[in-house]
């Protein structure tokens, strides 16, 4: 089949990095600068992606593969192939329409990206709060109150954090 196809279509012999040039009797011409073809038999080369502004070049474009971008420090990639760069916030914050805002009481974000999430509700699992939550950290759930009955081994909770919070009950 391949042999038949190449007899019918001379372009199928053009390797990656070239294109089948109709203006030159369908001979294989190298991709022009700033373009590439990642597969053989192509009639055109694709324009290389340019990493501009907050996008920086992670991998240069070659005649056979597109450039790859990532984000400049202070930003992180979103979307397939890093199609967007989003500004980082601090831990304990989330990016809103009005910029980086502190997490509301009862929520936390332990990363520089993403949204603030509610503290774990320890009581739903029949447990008690061992360490209070903060804007940057979730609560730590400890043994259930029943497990801490007299005679049972108890856990001494550490000193409260600087910004103590309580798990929403």
């Amino acid at each position: 089949f391949e042999r038949t196809r190449s007899l019918q279509d001379p372009c199928s012999n053009c390797p990656a990095g070239t294109f089948c040039d109709n203006n030159r009797n369908q001979i294989c011409s190298p991709c022009p600068p700033n373009s590439f073809s990642s597969a053989g038999g192509q009639r055109t080369c694709d324009i290389c992606r340019q990493c501009k502004g907050v996008f920086r070049t992670r991998k240069e474009c070659s005649s056979t593969s597109n450039a790859e971008c990532d984000c400049t420090p202070g930003f992180h990639c979103l979307g397939a192939g890093c199609s967007m760069c989003e500004q980082d916030c601090k831990q304990g914050q989330e990016l809103t329409k009005k910029g980086c805002k502190d997490c509301c009481f009862g929520t936390f974000n332990d990363q520089k990206r993403g949204i603030c999430r509610p503290w774990t509700n320890c009581s739903l699992d029949g447990k008690s709060v061992l360490v209070n939550g903060t804007k940057e950290r979730d609560v730590v759930c400890g043994p259930s109150p029943a497990d801490l009955s007299p005679g049972a081994s108890s856990v001494t909770p550490p000193a409260p954090a600087r910004e103590p919070g309580h798990s929403p009950q």
Epitope: C69, C85, C100
Partner: nanobody, 122 residues
Framework: EVQLVESGGGLVQPGGSLRLSCAAS????????MSWARQTPGKGFEWVSG???????YYTESVKDRFTISRDNSKNTLYLQMNSLRPEDTAVYYC????????????????WGQGTQVTVSS
């Protein structure tokens, strides 16, 4: 071909003012959201301000009440009026299209100018 050309940068004393301009061509400016970013050697890139085609404006916290973004669709020009300038505002300022309409987010299809240097120093 899309072109964004910034101008108006320079050296200014703390407390002073500058007005940056960005002349746009090669696309329908009036229906495009636009933004300003800045880049400092120490802090890297920072999203500064954005304006929707309808005129709604957005600012990063550190420039609120000091900077004003505006646009003149008849002149295809974006502006950034910078008042009460501080040494920490020293940066290269870039004009960019803002297709995502999301604070602090640019997409690969957005276009960028070459930047204009703003230096705030006594």
């Amino acid at each position: 071909e899309v072109q964004l050309v910034e101008s108006g940068g320079g050296l200014v004393q703390p407390g002073g003012s500058l007005r940056l301009s960005c002349a746009a061509s090669g696309f329908t400016f009036s229906s495009s959201a636009m933004s300003w970013a800045r880049q400092t050697p120490g802090k890297g890139f920072e999203w500064v301000s954005g304006i929707y085609s309808g005129g709604s404006t957005y600012y990063t916290e550190s420039v609120k009440d000091r900077f004003t973004i505006s646009r003149d669709n008849s002149k295809n020009t974006l502006y950034l009026q910078m008042n009460s300038l501080r040494p920490e505002d020293t940066a290269v300022y870039y004009c960019a299209t803002w297709g995502t309409l999301r604070f602090g987010v640019w997409a690969e299809y957005d276009h960028w100018g070459q930047g204009t240097q703003v230096t705030v120093s006594s």
